[in-house]
């Protein structure tokens, strides 16, 4: 899995989208979890409605909300009133029984001010063993990183 970086401004809301194959994940609940360390668990933050047919209903845990468009195949997580400690590694997951498939790995970064981040074209230049690809922009400040750029936690 590549990792997608989503950057948001402190105090504002950040919307994270996780696209998936709606047929492959038909009937499955989804979850948003935070990776606690390279080898640590992915701690559940919030999950979609217990009844899959009601997955479109927004569920909240504190300032984090989740909703699932099961037909379109897009899981959406909203982090309201973004705070510095919301920065970190997360996963969108598809649940089946006691197992969880990773839909997307997400790196959330919190900006002090819109002017305090560098544009993708002005990032640090990776070394020879690393690579960076400005693969796509889903939001004004979202991008994908290749597997080689930073070490990724295992799927839990």
């Amino acid at each position: 899995h590549n990792t997608t970086v989503f950057q948001g401004v402190e105090g504002q809301s950040l919307q994270v989208s996780c696209p998936y194959d709606s047929m492959k994940h038909w009937g499955r609940r989804k979850a948003w979890c935070r990776q606690l360390g390279e080898k640590g668990p992915c701690q559940r933050v919030v999950s979609t409605h217990n009844l899959w047919l009601l997955s479109f209903l927004r569920r909240r845990n504190g300032s984090t909300a989740i909703t699932d468009d099961t037909l379109g195949g897009t899981l959406t997580i909203t982090l309201r009133n973004l705070q510095p400690h919301d920065a970190g590694f997360y996963q969108c997951q598809s649940l089946h029984g006691s197992e969880a498939d990773t839909l997307r790995k997400v790196l959330v970064e919190v900006l002090a001010d819109p002017l305090d981040h560098r544009d993708a074209g002005d990032l640090w230049v990776p070394g020879e063993s690393e690579s960076f690809e400005d693969a796509h922009v889903e939001h004004s400040i979202s991008r994908s990183l290749l597997e080689g750029e930073i070490p990724f936690p295992p799927t839990s």
Epitope: E38, H85, R118, W124
Partner: antibody
Framework: QVQLVESGGGLVKPGGSLRLSCAAS????????MSWIRQAPGKGLEWVSY????????YYADSVKGRFTISRDNAKNSLYLQMNSLRAEDTAVYYC??????????????WGQGTTVTVSS | EIVLTQSPATLSLSPGERATLSCRAS??????LAWYQQKPGQAPRLLIY???NRATGIPARFSGSGSGTDFTLTISSLEPEDFAVYYC?????????FGGGTKVEIK
């Protein structure tokens, strides 16, 4: 063991430039946000700047914004602070520190020994 | 900017006594407060994070408490090596800030 070693400090004239370096070892450098903190002689601690794991998110204190530039090279396990237009009030011991969160912010759980920057004519 | 005010500025105590250091924030920092110890000529050392969690290798005589705006660092029984300057620091909101420090000196 986990270690941070700063270098590059010295005596510089007002308006001059200096580049500090911090070499990290004993941990996966690219997993962590890194920061620079300074301490003027006989004074308390002041947060100067931090940089995210990938280098894409940066924060500067107002007192150094526009004059200092933080950067990192994950391939070399190194953190840098380019200091331009130095002023007498920038005289301090500069510490490199690791933020304890996994790809995130957190308390500074590992510190370097510090490097002294003196700005004087 | 969140201002952290530490009190007292200096605490004069004898080894074996209990030390109580205070840190007050100008607005709520939830539990995102850390305590550091600094000895002369040395770098600061993390003691407590998230208001009450001891960092790795920190003796049990150090404890932290509080949330919101009022925080306390307690050293249950001072050892000779505990005489130093102690700083609190918040990482709840930008810009991250430190308190002015409390010096714990031998009486």
């Amino acid at each position: 063991q986990v270690q941070l070693v700063e270098s590059g400090g010295g005596l510089v004239k007002p308006g001059g430039s200096l580049r500090l370096s911090c070499a990290a070892s004993g941990f996966t450098f690219s997993d962590y946000y890194m920061s620079w903190i300074r301490q003027a002689p006989g004074k308390g601690l002041e947060w100067v700047s931090y940089i995210s794991s990938s280098g894409s998110t940066i924060y500067y204190a107002d007192s150094v914004k526009g004059r200092f530039t933080i950067s990192r090279d994950n391939a070399k396990n190194s953190l840098y602070l380019q200091m331009n237009s130095l002023r007498a009030e920038d005289t301090a011991v500069y510490y490199c520190a690791r933020l304890g969160g996994y790809y995130s912010l957190g308390p500074m759980d590992v510190w370097g020994q510090g490097t002294t920057v003196t700005v004087s004519s | 900017e969140i201002v952290l005010t530490q009190s007292p500025a200096t605490l004069s105590l004898s080894p074996g006594e209990r030390a109580t250091l205070s840190c007050r924030a100008s607005q709520s920092v939830s539990s995102y407060l850390a305590w550091y110890q600094q000895k002369p000529g040395q770098a600061p050392r993390l003691l407590i994070y998230d208001a009450s969690n001891r960092a790795t290798g920190i003796p049990a005589r150090f404890s932290g408490s509080g949330s919101g705006t009022d925080f306390t660092l307690t050293i249950s029984s001072l050892e000779p090596e505990d005489f130093a300057v102690y700083y609190c620091q918040q990482d709840s909101a930008f810009p991250f800030t430190f308190g002015g420090g409390t010096k714990v000196e031998i009486k």
